[in-house]
Interface confidence: low
Amino acid sequence: IPVIEPSGPELVVKPGETVTLRCVGNGSVEWDGPISPHWTLYSDGPSSVLTTNNATFQNTRTYRCTEPGDPLGGSAAIHLYVKDPARPWNVLAKEVVVFEDQDALLPCLLTDPVLEAGVSLVRLRGRPLLRHTNYSFSPWHGFIIHRAKFIQGQDYQCSALMGGRKVMSISIRLKVQKVIPGPPALTLVPAELVRIRGEAAQIVCSASNIDVDFDVFLQHNTTKLAIPQRSDFHDNRYQKVLTLSLGQVDFQHAGNYSCVASNVQGKHSTSMFFQVVESAYLDLSSEQNLIQEVTVGEGLNLKVMVEAYPGLQGFNWTYLGPFSDHQPEPKLANATTKDTYRHTFTLSLPRLKPSEAGRYSFLARNPGGWRALTFELTLRYPPEVSVIWTSINGSGTLLCAASGYPQPNVTWLQCAGHTDRCDEAQVLQVWVDPHPEVLSQEPFQKVTVQSLLTAETLEHNQTYECRAHNSVGSGSWAFIPISAGARTHPPDEFLFTP
């Protein structure tokens, strides 16, 4: 570690005196710069010497000597005071810049250590410090404002009591810069714009930043627009607003508009699309199939997407029949706006009743005219089954009627014993009717089919069951003969599969 002669750590001299500072080390040594022109620097063997023949208060500061070859990187320092009775302060910098919440060193060095007891920090022209200014003083370094705030960016003077009067330093300007967390915040309004050719339009690009040093511009496709900028300050932020006003839009005004703002932290941009159309438009669509099938008792939401400009002047859901003249309850109709020109309209149909099957139409109107979108709603029903004994052309016949939607298929079962329903263990024969006769098939209604089982005699100890099923469910009806007779069999023309 190098050694400084005189040994220090402080040396007090008067103006005009000769001062010699010698630094000696094991190897070559050097003084930390920059050394002011008032000093003469020369080498004397392994030592480096700083000397001045006419010390002034401006020589007041700490001088540090290092030994570059020392692996431990040791250094030695001495603080020189040149106590000038007219100049209590040596100011090393007229301007200090820090970020908020950093400590700010105001480098006014006291030229006479005796004066330390009477020092204070004031704002320019002796004004007091702002409240909550927390500071400390070091005669070697100056005043430190701890955790400086933006509002403390002011002109300061260091004050010392000399012979009963306060003597000020020259002023030091402290600049406290706000810590910029990121690029400016942006808004571009509207997020989307549609206009008919000849209409007026306005696009507003605004950016805000915590300090005034930021730029903002509005760009149309790849062209930067020259728009006057309005500046403001509120909510502790600087605002810059660009407003593009178009009296009569044309197709060349259409396209992508980008609002771009930048500061030292980087760039931020947001875009919108401006569409210019020849005339009003109104488009209805649905992501759903327009033909809907729902099981009775369940619920359904019908959704329509509307794209329109200008805005809608009217809209409603209408039930077109065929079952009743009821209309959808308004409380079941819901409208949500996805954005300015796109809307979703929903009709909720909970716990559907048979009378609610049919056509539902959504109608909308704007200056472009009327449009409608119609859904066809068919209800699904599980089969209902009934069996009767009848005589057809002199032959005894079991007649099974099954009603449901979708159209039920029919299966006959013959099983041993008397039972409400044949189970697999009891089944003696199975016949599937491939083409039951359709008795009725009206839109939005159940399909009724009929299947015949011709029997010469029915055995009294057996059960004949008609089963019908569709995608919703199944139904069955068991028939038990009352008197004994010959065993039944399927007629040839039935083409049943055993």
Partner: antibody
């Protein structure tokens, strides 16, 4: 008595370098807190600050011209020199030097131009 | 950079009139403002410093006021020798910037 006087060529050609000298008396630029600045004024237009130099050789430049300006001082001759490179016809103006000061103990420093030279008209033309 | 917007750019007044010139800074300049008077063919002359302090030798009819971003130069009773162009200068932050000037003419 404080006086300042600008000197330099009345006519320079485009792309040439302008060198202006401010010779002053009545104060010293070695005095603690003292400074000298340059200001210009195009014909019929407002004043524009160019550069300052302080007693401790601290220098400040107008960022819009920083790459073209150099300010220096010769305290032994009581002179401040401003050079401006790559002159253009838009640089046609009256160029003034002015003193910044003085520091009055124990009052505040006066950071303003309190004494001005008479100005020198510089025309940039080919 | 701090912009200094001076208004009006020109005004016509008569001897004895009270004249007010304003300077608006684009951000707070903490009273770091001076006012200068310039007559045709002459160098500017310092009238007011630190927004409101009168320079030695300047008549007391000149006064300065204001704070934050808004500053005013007032001539309480215009004299024949006061017809000139007036400039404000901020030194709150580099680069120091002047206002655009206000020309005071005889009505």
């Amino acid at each position: 008595e404080v006086t300042l006087k600008e000197s330099g060529p009345a006519l320079v050609k485009p792309t040439q370098t302008l060198t202006l000298t401010c010779t002053f008396s009545g104060f010293s630029l070695t005095t603690y807190g003292m400074g000298v600045g340059w200001i210009r004024q195009p014909p019929g237009k407002a004043l524009e600050w160019l550069a300052n130099i302080w007693w401790d050789d601290d220098k400040y430049y107008n960022p819009s011209l920083k790459n073209r300006l150099t300010i220096s001082k010769d305290t032994s001759k009581n002179q401040v020199v401003l050079t401006m490179t790559n002159m253009d016809p838009v640089d046609t103006a009256t160029y003034y030097c002015a003193r910044i000061g003085p520091i009055k103990y124990p009052t505040a420093p006066y950071r303003y131009f309190d004494f001005w030279g008479q100005g020198t008209m510089v025309t940039v033309s080919s | 950079d701090i912009q200094m917007t001076q208004s009006p750019s020109s005004l016509s007044a008569s001897v004895g009139d009270r004249v007010t010139i304003t300077c608006l800074a684009s951000e707070d300049i903490y009273d770091n403002l001076a006012w200068y008077q310039q007559k045709p063919g002459k160098a500017p002359k310092l009238l007011i410093y630190y927004a409101s302090s009168l320079q030695d030798g300047v008549p007391s009819r000149f006064s300065g006021s204001g704070s934050g971003t808004d500053y005013t130069l007032t001539i309480s009773s215009l004299q024949p020798e006061d017809f000139a162009t007036y400039y404000c200068l901020q030194d709150s932050e580099y680069p120091w910037t002047f206002g655009g000037g206000t020309k005071v003419e005889i009505k």
